[in-house]
Interface confidence: low
């Protein structure tokens, strides 16, 4: 999809005459009809397959055509197409005399054609204008033309569609050649894969949007590199998820059984000796003169 643009620059009709040689009265009030069609070795009658456009009356006899792209877009003339640009074309430009304000073909007198030019050839897509001048015995037309791609279309034939987007289907802008340029935080062929938080563990973490690090089951921490011990693990750690490796002095499935009661609780009194004897088990050996379970008597 693209646009063939035609910039009319100057039309010279010094004698103010029609193609028949008859003079216009009072002067040739000139407008143009443009027909753009597929390449023909000899431009032939038939539909304007690539489009057609007409101008209002632009001047009388000889005149320069001002650039009016800001005020209504009349010059350059726009001939949009919605197909792959083939690289070749035929262009017919007719200058007509309009005695009145009605420019419809049926409203014009039978002898209203001033001049007709037909060119054909190759034209690549690009920003640069190609300038041309066509003369016949009575008139001269100077003009420039080019083909540019429509918005969101790129490439040598304006066939590469790239519409910048920032939604579920992708997060990208378009390069001049139509290739995708991912927005920050996104990667992948279609820029639909988020780049996770820097350092996010490759196996244990993932993300659904950029700079995120969502932990898989069994992992925790900002970078999902810390395992989660077994639920209920009291005095233990893990090296893999759901493990409960007991700290020194603790035992049992949940590391909640005290294997060092004497040290942690000092239950024996009056200088007696404490001996650990299994989980939460201990015995006090009293000094002479003391008795009781904790040598408290």
């Amino acid at each position: 999809s693209g646009v063939f643009q035609l910039q009319l620059q100057e039309f010279i009709n010094e004698r103010g005459v029609l193609a028949s040689g008859r003079p216009c009265e009072p002067g040739c009030r000139t407008f143009f009809r443009v027909c753009l069609k597929h390449f023909q070795a000899v431009v032939s009658p038939g539909p304007c397959t690539f489009g057609t456009v007409s101008t209002p009356v632009l001047g009388t006899n000889s005149f320069a055509v001002r650039d009016d792209s800001s005020g209504g877009g009349r010059n350059p003339l726009q001939l949009p197409f919605n197909f792959t640009w083939p690289g070749t074309f035929s262009l017919i430009i007719e200058a007509w005399h309009a005695p009145g304000d009605d420019l419809r073909p049926e409203a014009l007198p039978p002898d209203a054609l001033i001049s007709k030019i037909a060119i054909q050839g190759s034209l690549a897509v690009g920003q640069n204008w190609r300038t041309d001048e066509q003369n016949d015995t009575l008139t001269r037309l100077s003009y420039s033309y080019r083909v540019i791609c429509s918005d969101n279309y790129y490439g040598e034939s304006c066939s590469r569609l790239c519409k910048k987007r920032d939604d579920h289907f992708g997060h990208y802008e378009c390069q001049p050649d139509g290739s995708l340029s991912c927005l920050p935080g996104w990667t992948g062929k279609y820029c639909d894969q988020p780049i996770c938080l820097s350092g996010c563990h490759e196996q244990n973490g993932y993300c659904s949007k950029p700079d995120e690090c969502i932990c898989r089951p069994g992992w925790q921490g900002r970078l999902c590199n810390e395992c989660i011990p077994h639920n209920g693990c009291r005095h233990g750690t893990c090296s893999i998820p759901w493990q409960c490796a007991c700290d020194e002095g603790w035992g049992g499935l949940f590391c909640d059984q005290d294997l060092n009661y004497c040290t942690h609780h000092s239950p024996c009194k009056n200088g007696s000796t404490c001996s650990n004897s299994g989980p939460k088990g201990y015995t006090c050996t009293c000094l002479p003169g003391y008795t009781g379970e904790h040598c408290e008597l």
Partner: antibody, heavy 119, light 111 residues
Framework: EVQLQQSGPELVKTGASVKISCKAS????????IHWVKQSHGKSLEWIGY????????NYNQKFKGKATFTVDTSSSTAFMQFNSLTSEDSAVYYC????????????WGQGTSVTVSS | DIVLTQSPASLAVSLGQRATISCRAS??????????MKWFQQKPGQPPKLLIY???NQGSGVPARFSGSGSGTDFSLNIHPMEEDDTAMYFC?????????FGGGTKLEIK
């Protein structure tokens, strides 16, 4: 003339799988996407997902992930949808539809394939 | 998921009169200046047929009596003048976000 011709009705047992085909003609198959849509009896339409006929990229409705699998065979211009572990809830008419760009939509549809799941 | 609520659920309109069907989205379905809203017609035993895309653009070969309007969350389908052939179910559908979703449908009949 653009046409999408779907395979015939299916009567399948609970727990089985079914593979529906959608043969395209009359247009450039690989330039388009094929969508799959479910319509339970007397109910609205439910989008299952789509597959790119160009590169096989898929996008599924989360509800049907693991249930539906899309494939294409570009040599025969045919799209397929396999539906697994069928239950009575999967009894419905399934349509394929083509799409060229997200701004136009599903402009041509297959005639629909009726799937009946029986115990 | 974006929920589309159609109203009314059923509608009876006299021949030659105007039928208006509404579709409200639970959130905006506009993106980059485009409304990702479509309208489909479905007759019994037939697949849906695309009527309107991008909220207001007519599908290929769709009669001019079908027109769509709206943006953001509120959309409508107008049929005028109503013809006998227009008796059908009508569905709106959004394609802004996955999963694409359809409205519950409106049954249009001749009064």
């Amino acid at each position: 003339e653009v046409q999408l011709q779907q395979s015939g009705p299916e009567l399948v047992k609970t727990g089985a799988s079914v593979k529906i085909s959608c043969k395209a003609s009359g247009y450039s198959f690989t330039a388009y996407y094929i969508h799959w849509v479910k319509q339970s009896h007397g109910k609205s339409l439910e989008w299952i997902g789509y597959i790119s006929c160009y590169n096989g990229a898929t996008n599924y409705n989360q509800k049907f992930k693991g249930k539906a699998t899309f494939t294409v065979d570009t040599s025969s211009s045919t799209a397929f949808m396999q539906f697994n572990s069928l239950t009575s809830e999967d009894s419905a008419v399934y349509y394929c539809a083509r799409d060229y760009d997200y701004d136009v939509g599903m402009d041509y549809w297959g005639q629909g394939t009726s799937v009946t799941v029986s115990s | 998921d974006i929920v589309l609520t159609q109203s009314p659920a059923s509608l009876a309109v006299s021949l030659g009169q105007r039928a208006t069907i509404s579709c409200r989205a639970s959130e905006s379905v506009d993106n980059y200046g485009i409304s990702f809203m479509k309208w489909f017609q479905q007759k019994p035993g037939q697949p849906p047929k695309l009527l309107i895309y991008a909220a207001s653009n007519q599908g290929s070969g769709v009669p001019a009596r079908f027109s769509g309007s709206g943006s953001g969350t509120d959309f409508s389908l107008n049929i005028h003048p109503m013809e006998e052939d227009d008796t059908a179910m009508y569905f709106c559908q959004q394609s802004k976000e996955v999963p694409w979703t359809f409205g519950g449908g409106t049954k249009l009949e001749i009064k």
